[in-house]
């Protein structure tokens, strides 16, 4: 989701935005700081073993509107939050995993009778 009621239409920022990056640092990052013309993000998702993994970093303006929309993906629990209001704003983003649905239990590795 986007924070602070930002509009969904991506508009070019007049200046570069610095974001914290973790597990998602591009080659041009330095000291776990990346730069972007788009958004900072923090995302939580389950890995293959069902363990929650938090990643953060930069999303370029191109395509970031779609990526920040947090559209549900079948059979995948994940949540993303995006921000632009200040440098390293994603330090303060704490997305949570969406609740398990009944069918997630059925389709998952553990079956409840």
């Amino acid at each position: 989701k986007k924070e602070d009621g930002e509009s969904t239409a991506p508009t070019a920022r007049p200046k570069v935005l610095r974001c914290k990056c973790h597990h998602h640092c591009p080659e041009d990052s330095v000291n776990n700081i990346c730069s972007t013309d788009g958004y900072c993000f923090t995302m939580i998702e389950e890995d293959d073993s069902g363990t929650p993994v938090v990643t953060s970093g930069c999303l370029g303006l191109e395509g970031s509107d779609f990526q920040c929309r947090d559209t549900p993906i079948p059979h995948q629990r994940r949540s993303i939050e995006c921000c632009t209001e200040r440098n390293e704003c994603n330090k303060d983003l704490h997305p949570t995993l969406p609740p398990l649905k009944d069918r997630d239990f059925v389709d998952g590795p553990i079956h409840h009778k």
């Epitope: 007049p14 200046k15 570069v16 610095r18 591009p26 080659e27 041009d28 990052s29 330095v30 700081i33 990346c34 730069s35 972007t36 013309d37 788009g38 930069c58 370029g60 303006l61 191109e62 200040r86 440098n87 390293e88």
Partner: antibody, heavy 116, light 112 residues
């Protein structure tokens, strides 16, 4: 029009500190980063660091960490760079420059002379 | 740090000639956003640098169309199609893809 006003020159003694100023006008001060660049004769241009006036977030060239401190006063649209423990190596022209994704406007530069 | 190597160091030209300046970077300047942050500046004697070209090939406002920039990755060129007296000075390339931002050592354009 965009203007970045810097004092023309400053003469200081070795071991002291100096605070250089850069007054911005003609644009929204908080909408762009302010960078500082050092130029010594025959040594080219060196990027010192930058500050985002909207949140005072700074990034420094590792080489100038501990030497330069960048600050802003948004009420007067002025950026400052303090240089400490000055030596003759700090004698140079110092430019402030407006930065979005590239520097588009430069100040006229302050010639700093460190001499006893 | 990314090293920016400019050639030649000095470029003697006759007025009306074409001039070409090369700038090579020690790393690719393609940013993770897909942009290439390579820029060209002209510094005349006793003045501050002035922006000519930003992001490889975009002329800054008020810059004559005799100035053009090209290149990609690590290899970039500034061309002046017909040199005029007001073009004399030192040309710098600069990158703002990688922190710390770095500059070329400069190319002095002078009259033959």
């Amino acid at each position: 029009q965009v203007q970045l006003q810097q004092p023309g020159a400053d003469l200081v003694k070795p071991g002291t500190s100096v605070k250089l100023s850069c007054k911005a006008s003609g644009y929204t001060f908080t909408s762009y980063w302010m960078q500082w660049v050092k130029q010594r004769p025959g040594q080219g241009l060196e990027w010192i660091g930058e500050i985002d006036p909207s949140d005072t977030y700074t990034m420094y060239n590792q080489k100038f960490k501990g030497k330069a401190t960048l600050t802003v006063d948004t009420s007067s649209s002025t950026a400052y760079m303090q240089l400490s423990s000055l030596t003759s190596e700090d004698s140079a022209v110092y430019y402030c420059a407006r930065f979005g994704y590239y520097v588009d406007y430069w100040g006229q530069g302050t010639t700093l002379t460190v001499s006893s | 740090d990314v090293v920016m190597t400019q050639t030649p160091l000095s470029l003697p030209v006759s007025l009306g000639d074409q001039a070409s300046i090369s700038c090579r970077s020690s790393q690719s300047l393609v940013h993770s956003t897909g942009n290439t942050y390579l820029h060209w500046y002209l510094q005349k004697a006793g003045q501050s640098p002035k922006l000519l070209i930003y992001k490889v090939s975009n002329r800054f406002s008020g810059v004559p169309d005799r100035f053009s920039g090209s290149g990609s990755g690590t290899d970039f060129t500034l061309k002046i199609s017909r040199v005029e007296a007001e073009d004399l000075g030192v040309y710098f390339c600069s990158q703002s893809t990688h922190v710390p931002f770095t500059f070329g050592s400069g190319t002095k354009l002078e009259i033959k």
